[in-house]
Amino acid sequence: DAGVIQSPRHEVTEMGQEVTLRCKPISGHNSLFWYRQTMMRGLELLIYFNNNVPIDDSGMPEDRFSAKMPNASFSTLKIQPSEPRDSAVYFCASSL
């Protein structure tokens, strides 16, 4: 099993541009999670899906952030417009 697959591995963009992060969860997993990690703020849960349905997006109250899970094998996290403080490591995770 390849595990959770994210793309891109690295992203550099200008302030104000749109950024789209992609995630392919492990096959058969029902839940998908997007996290953000920075030195200043630590690890934050942004949103999670169960059976493709967003359950809790309270970690991303800024409407610059949006996430979708159109099917069981794909999710996107979009930032529009991006800001310098969005610089972070973004993790996707999945679970049964």
């Epitope: 703020r41 630590g42 690890l43 934050e44 849960l45 942004l46 359950i55 809790d56 309270s58 970690g59 991303m60 109250p61 800024e62 409407d63 610059r64 529009q80 417009p81 800001e83």
Partner: antibody
Framework: EVQLVESGGGLVQPGGSLRLSCAAS????????MHWVRQAPGKGLEWVSY????????YYADTLKGRFTISRDNSKNTLYLQMNSLRAEDTAVYYC??????????WGQGTTVTVSS | DNQLTQSPSFLSASVGDRVTITCRAS?????IYWYQQKPGKAPKLLIY???NLAPGVPSRFSGSGSGNEYTLTISSLQPEDFATYYC?????????FGQGTKLEIK
């Protein structure tokens, strides 16, 4: 029926502290982000702070960072705002509000904080 | 911080009038949210994501706009609509409000 009930307001001297509480009922508190908003007498609304459902994401108004601390206890269905080093300009009605539809979809009735010597 | 400026700050109108309140943002926002507040009461959500009516809000209220400029329109004022209206943005923290528009009976 969604209900938010603030408490803990009162008269406090400059430099003092208060802890506001917001008791939630009628919805699954642990699934929702929560805000604090304040309104000085005769003035408009001012956003104070936000906390996500599991407390991992927290935001503050820039002017209040370091003096105010937002927290929550999901086992008690309660939101808190710890306010330290209070100033006269912190005098206001403080509202808690639930995050819903991307906005603040339910509000409490407010609790009044007066900072005066 | 993204500053929201509402115009007008005060508006006198009569029952049955059509009124429009404008909210201008110093930086572009994705959406605007509108609240109504009556004296001594908590604010009430009217419109979310620019144009969606909150549950229980009458259809005479509508919202529109994009970028830096948004509007709240009341198609035919009713006595219960006289209140103060606030816009808010959630595009970027801090989640600023407009200064408010007080709608009074002419």
């Amino acid at each position: 029926e969604v209900q938010l009930v603030e408490s803990g307001g009162g008269l406090v001297q400059p430099g003092g502290s208060l802890r506001l509480s917001c008791a939630a009922s009628g919805f699954t508190f642990s699934n929702f982000g929560m805000h604090w908003v304040r309104q000085a007498p005769g003035k408009g609304l001012e956003w104070v702070s936000y906390i996500s459902s599991g407390s991992s994401t927290i935001y503050y108004a820039d002017t209040l960072k370091g003096r105010f601390t937002i927290s929550r206890d999901n086992s008690k269905n309660t939101l808190y705002l710890q306010m330290n080093s209070l100033r006269a300009e912190d005098t206001a009605v403080y509202y808690c509000a639930r995050r819903g539809n991307g906005a603040m979809d339910y509000w409490g009735q407010g609790t009044t904080v007066t900072v005066s010597s | 911080d993204n500053q929201l400026t509402q115009s007008p700050s005060f508006l006198s109108a009569s029952v049955g009038d059509r009124v429009t309140i404008t909210c201008r943002a110093s930086s572009s926002v994705n959406y605007i949210y509108w609240y109504q507040q009556k004296p001594g009461k908590a604010p009430k959500l009217l419109i979310y994501y620019t144009s969606n009516l909150a549950p229980g809000v009458p259809s005479r209220f509508s919202g529109s706009g994009s970028g830096n400029e948004y509007t709240l329109t009341i198609s035919s004022l009713q006595p219960e609509d006289f209140a103060t209206y606030y816009c808010q943005q959630f595009t970027s923290s801090p989640f600023t409000f407009g200064q408010g528009t007080k709608l009074e009976i002419k």
